[in-house]
């Protein structure tokens, strides 16, 4: 009786997702069989996140606007370690937008979800940001510094990276 | 080239108002923000504000609010800057710089003299 | 807002001359910190920024250095077309701030 409540409510969940995503791939959590955590196919995980390269060029507001319809944000790096894991899947010579931005052009940046702005944990190139008119980040190679990020105009087409929490059923 | 064409000088009564101009040629116009920039014998130069000619939205030295007003027209590549109320204290040379690269204002108009006089 | 001083205002040296101009922020500006030359018609030209970067165009005579709160302008061999005001300006923080202008004569 508990297993089928469980596996309904299993159901239930997997059916919210699939007006988004018609296809997860889930793996067990630790021991126990009750707990799976699941990404969107061909999504990538790390920690408690799903990552989406998308390849099509567009400006900053329609890629975040292209994220969120598939119910996640534009990437908001937080560590060393998660901008390792990501820049496995990107291509060095594209540019990918991050869900960074300076709205009003006076240095003052926001992630998209809100998490504070911390300049201790920044990968800017660099010399970078530089530009008051360059009001999106970017990830992108360079060949003196590998990768990191660099301000550029909102409106230049660019591919991009979105994020979203891990689905846990 | 880039250039930076500044409207004449002015010579005004005090109380009023002027709006002076500044149209940008041989570059892309609304990839570059726009500075006002003043200069007066007291003060040496001082930074007024800038305006994106891209957003139309501005930022403003706290000393110049309610002085100052930054628009833009994309239309003709022209940035203008009003100054209301003048007093003998915005006797001055007024230019235009265009937004570049670090932090830098890489290209100036010729300037605009501004004499308010009774 | 940050304070751009500029301890000399004004300064004499002889063509050919080595001549160097400093600019001291109230506060470290990382290195963003940019020199202009004001000729006597006003003329107004961007001459190095990011410290050390020289503008399209200007003679490799002008270098810029420093870091942190301290900087400098240096002419390495003097021309007659030298003669102007030279004002720093830092663009790390809003609002922008300029030094008081050093004004270059001929001795």
């Known amino acids: 009786n508990f297993m089928y409540s469980k596996t309904v409510k299993r159901l239930s969940k997997l059916r919210e997702y699939q007006q988004y995503h018609p296809s997860l791939t889930c793996v067990m959590e630790g021991k126990d069989i009750e707990d799976w955590s699941c990404c969107p196919t061909p999504w990538t995980s790390f920690q408690s996140s799903c990552y989406f390269i998308s390849t099509g060029m567009q400006s900053w507001t329609k890629s975040q606007k292209n994220c969120s319809v598939m119910g996640a944000d534009l990437v908001v790096i937080n560590t060393r370690e998660e901008q390792d894991f990501i820049i496995q899947n990107l291509k060095r010579n594209s540019s990918y937008f991050l869900g960074l931005s300076d709205p009003g052009g006076r240095r003052h940046w926001q992630w998209v979800d809100q998490t504070p702005y911390n300049e201790n944990v920044t990968f800017w190139h660099s010399g970078e940001p530089n530009n008051l008119d360059e009001r999106c980040a970017i990830i992108n190679f360079r060949s003196s510094e590998e990768w990191g990020w660099n301000d550029i105009h909102c409106h230049v087409p660019q591919k991009s990276i979105c994020k979203m929490k891990k689905i846990y059923i | 080239q880039v250039q930076l064409q500044q409207s004449g000088a002015e010579l005004v009564r005090p109380g009023v108002s002027v709006k002076i101009s500044c149209k940008g040629s041989?570059?892309?116009?609304?990839?570059?923000?726009m500075h006002w920039v003043k200069q007066s014998h007291a003060k040496s130069l001082e930074w007024i504000g800038v305006?994106?000619?891209?957003?139309?939205?501005?930022n403003y030295n706290q000393k110049f609010k309610g002085k100052a007003t930054m628009t833009v027209d994309k239309s003709s590549t022209t940035a203008y800057m009003e100054l209301a109320r003048l007093t003998s204290e915005d006797s001055a040379i007024y230019y235009c710089?265009?937004?570049?690269?670090?932090?830098?204002?890489?290209?100036w108009g010729q300037g605009t003299s501004v004499t308010v006089s009774s | 807002d940050i304070q751009m001083t500029q301890s000399t205002s004004s300064l004499s040296a002889s063509l050919g001359d080595r001549v160097t101009i400093t600019c001291q922020a109230s506060?470290?500006?990382?290195?963003?910190l940019n020199w202009y030359q004001q000729k006597p018609d006003g003329t107004v030209k961007l001459l190095i920024y990011?410290?050390?970067n020289l503008h399209t165009g200007v003679p490799s005579r002008f270098s810029g250095s420093g870091s942190g709160t301290d900087y400098s302008l240096t002419i390495s061999n003097l021309q007659q077309e030298d003669i102007a005001t030279y004002y720093c300006?830092?663009?790390?923080?809003?609002?922008?701030?300029f030094g008081g202008g050093t004004k270059l004569e001929i001795k």
């Open positions: 710089a265009r937004n570049g690269n670090f932090y830098v204002m890489d290209y």
């Open positions: 041989g570059y892309t116009f609304t990839d570059y923000s």
């Open positions: 305006i994106s000619t891209y957003y139309g939205d501005s």
């Open positions: 506060q470290d500006i990382s290195n963003y």
């Open positions: 990011y410290t050390s």
């Open positions: 300006q830092q663009g790390n923080t809003l609002p922008w701030t």
